[in-house]
């Protein structure tokens, strides 16, 4: 038994002092708008559907349902004595999905269609989500909405990022087969895009692949082989989506940077960090040219985003994912250097422009501190004994350092007697020497090692 | 794993013929030309000729023209050398061997070779 | 045809040594590639494009030159690096040195 203090309907009058469920009406097996209370709240009886009239006499709203009364003002019980008649409308407005696949206006829908579905022996529809089917949940104050910036600036940018793929000839056959792939990001409407040199070494045949699945032959515009930075483009009737670069120069270590990439097609890859170091010491990882400077980030770079773009939160490039040298210690060629790229090759095509030469020996390179030492002696058990110098990350194939037997994982410690405490060391002689001769630790054991630097292009 | 698997030794007579297999798993057959090398007792590797899997196209040593024939089936994975007119001197191992090809340098090798199977050509 | 001239034919030398096998051709090549092949076995690809290291091959192993003349080294031999070397070459179809057969000491 319900006392009045129990009930949920407002007191009516001509009401009982106690509920007795034995004097109830006996109800329907099925009722259009579900189950209600009566305006004692006493007995369950059908509730009035969506639309329906309700207040006066003709009894309560459906579950889920509310009386309204014109204006929207809902009803009550100084309403209903005013005798005003109102109709039933559903509490909640915001259409949902069902589990039968079909989206409903609202809450009170879906259940109406329960309530048939159940008549009928099939199963209840129930609520999949919120939002229409094939919708996400568009809710703006949930925390999913208010806190998934990584995703907020991924869906932003993936648009333009590319999937690139590269094609080799068999020997004899002459016959193409795909051989390697890697990602780039448009920079122009009008097709323009950019990746690593390394992605579409050895004039490769190039595909470009864009996110909706369009495929296009690309035409390698310009290489900077030394910066690490080339420039295509494909031929693409209407305006593509576009990345804006950032400045890299404005990075400030423990900044959020996304790394996304399209490793595989009509898939983007997505990694994510913060910057480590910015700009490594102008020349610190002199890589290939004497003003190389590299971000540094523990966002995951590998062969499928290494091409593409390292964004920052407002979605600007600033930097070219370009390669990972161990666990958790990744670096990206800074946009500002992509941008002086750019402005050089512009000019190149535009006036064939003479370049003034650098010396160049073929090396990627870090300065050795105690620190990275030690943390590169716990990961490889063989690396040198040694706490200062300049450590090779990666020797470029056909240069000069490649001819001379340098190795990756080779410590210069000195060069033409000096001896060598940092990368910018190795920089500076470079610049001044004709000869470099190098001693360099392998292992546990000093070579002597002559290379000649070339003169190239800048 | 790449395997590249050859059968067994044979003995022939001068003048007969001879077919060896190699089953090929590990990767996409038809990615990759298939190459046949020689090796007689004491001397140099000596290349024989390649097969692209996919077309059939077939590329020849003009040492061997005439005499060698290299097939491939795709659904199978194999590929086929075939030598006629055996003579004393073929008497050799012969190695299937997969084309490599260097990415950074555009070079090509032989990256994967099969155990080799040994010809006996003897009256 | 690209004629190749493989130096030593054969030599001898203790564990530890600095072992050097050069290798001519008679018309400049882009790369070469050097092979190890132990009795009874197929041949295993060591340097691939002249200097790069093929996958699992120890460091002691490296690879030089340029145009027609080219080198081969082992830092410091071990016992199971007895075997004969080849030099290949791939200009327009492959060719190989006649080896260099290198023993212990």
């Known amino acids: 038994q319900l006392s009045r203090a129990g009930r949920s309907a407002p007191l009516a009058a001509g009401c009982p002092d106690r509920c007795e469920p034995a004097r109830c009406p006996p109800q329907p097996e099925h009722c259009e708008g579900g189950r209600a209370r009566d305006a004692c709240g006493c007995c369950e009886v059908c509730g009035a559907p969506e639309g329906a009239a309700c207040g006066l006499q003709e009894g309560p709203c459906g579950e889920g349902l509310q009386c309204v009364v014109p204006f929207g003002v809902p009803a009550s019980a100084t309403v209903r004595r005013r005798a005003q008649a109102g109709l039933c409308v559903c509490a909640s407005s915001e259409p949902v999905c069902g589990s039968d696949a079909n989206t409903y206006a609202n809450l009170c829908q879906l259940r109406a269609a329960s309530r048939r579905s159940e008549r009928l022996h099939r199963p209840p529809v129930i609520v999949l989500q919120r939002g229409a089917c094939g919708q996400g949940q568009e809710d703006p104050n949930s925390l999913r909405h208010k806190y998934n910036f990584i995703a907020d600036v991924v869906e932003k940018i993936a648009p333009a990022v590319v999937h690139i793929e590269l094609f080799r000839k068999l020997p004899f056959s002459k016959r193409e087969v795909p051989v390697a792939s890697g990602s780039g990001f448009i920079v122009s409407e009008d097709g323009l895009i950019v990746t690593n040199a390394h992605v579409v070494t050895n004039k490769h045949r190039v595909k470009v692949e864009l996110k909706n699945g369009a495929t296009y032959e690309a035409k390698i515009k310009d290489v900077d082989e030394k910066a690490d930075i080339a420039l295509i483009k494909i031929d693409h009737q209407g305006k593509l989506p576009v990345l804006l670069l950032g400045r890299s120069s404005e990075l400030r270590p423990g900044e959020f940077v996304v790394a996304i990439g399209s490793p595989f097609s009509l898939q983007n890859t997505v990694t994510t960090g913060i910057v480590s170091t910015t700009q490594r010491g102008g020349k610190e990882l002199g890589l290939r040219n004497s003003d190389m400077d590299y971000i540094q980030t523990d966002a995951i770079i590998n062969y499928g985003n290494s091409g593409g773009p390292l964004v920052n939160l407002d979605g600007e490039v600033i930097g070219i994912n370009t390669l990972k040298v161990t666990a958790g210690i990744s670096f990206a060629i800074p946009s500002d250097k992509i941008k002086k790229f750019l402005t050089e090759s512009h000019d190149r095509q535009a006036k064939g422009k003479a370049i003034t030469k650098k010396k160049y020996i073929g090396i990627r390179m870090m300065s050795l501190t105690s620190s990275k030492a030690k943390e590169l002696k716990d990961r490889h058990r063989d690396f040198p004994d040694v706490i200062s110098g300049a450590y090779i990350i990666e020797v470029i194939p056909d240069t000069p350092a490649e001819a001379g037997g340098l190795k990756e994982n080779d410590v210069i410690i000195s060069i033409n007697g000096q001896s060598v405490v940092s990368a910018n060391d190795v920089s500076d002689v470079i610049k001044r020497e004709s000869t470099l001769n190098m001693v360099v630790r392998r292992g546990n054991e000093d070579i002597m090692i002559t290379v000649i630097p070339e003169e190239i292009d800048p | 794993q790449v395997q590249l698997v050859q059968s067994g030794a044979e003995v022939k007579k001068p003048g007969a013929s001879v077919k060896v297999s190699c089953k090929a798993s590990?990767?996409?057959?038809?990615?990759?030309?298939m190459h046949w090398v020689r090796q007689a007792p004491g001397q140099r590797l000596e290349w024989m000729g390649a097969i692209d899997p996919e077309t059939g196209g077939t590329a020849y040593n003009q040492k061997f023209k005439g005499r060698v024939t290299i097939t491939a089936d795709k659904s199978a994975s194999t590929a086929y050398m075939e030598l006629s007119s055996l003579r004393s001197e073929d008497t050799a191992v012969y190695y299937c061997t997969r084309e490599g090809y260097s990415y950074e340098g555009g070079g090509y090798y032989f990256d994967y070779w099969g155990q080799g199977t040994l010809v006996t050509v003897s009256s | 045809d690209i004629q190749m001239t493989q130096s030593p034919s054969s030599l001898s030398a203790s564990v530890g040594d600095r072992v050097t096998i050069t290798c001519s051709v008679s018309?400049?090549?882009?790369?070469m590639y050097w092979y190890q092949q132990k009795p009874g076995k197929a041949p295993k690809l060591l340097i691939y494009?002249?200097?790069n290291l093929a996958s699992g091959v120890p460091s002691r192993f490296s690879g030089s030159g340029s145009g027609t003349d080219f080198t081969f080294t082992i830092s410091s031999l071990q016992p199971e690096d007895i075997a004969t070397y080849y030099c290949?070459?791939?200009?327009?179809?492959?060719?190989f040195g006649q080896g260099t057969k290198l023993e212990i000491k």
């Open positions: 590990g990767y996409t057959f038809t990615d990759y030309e």
């Open positions: 018309s400049s090549v882009s790369y």
């Open positions: 290949q070459q791939w200009s327009y179809y492959p060719t």
């Open positions: 494009d002249t200097s």
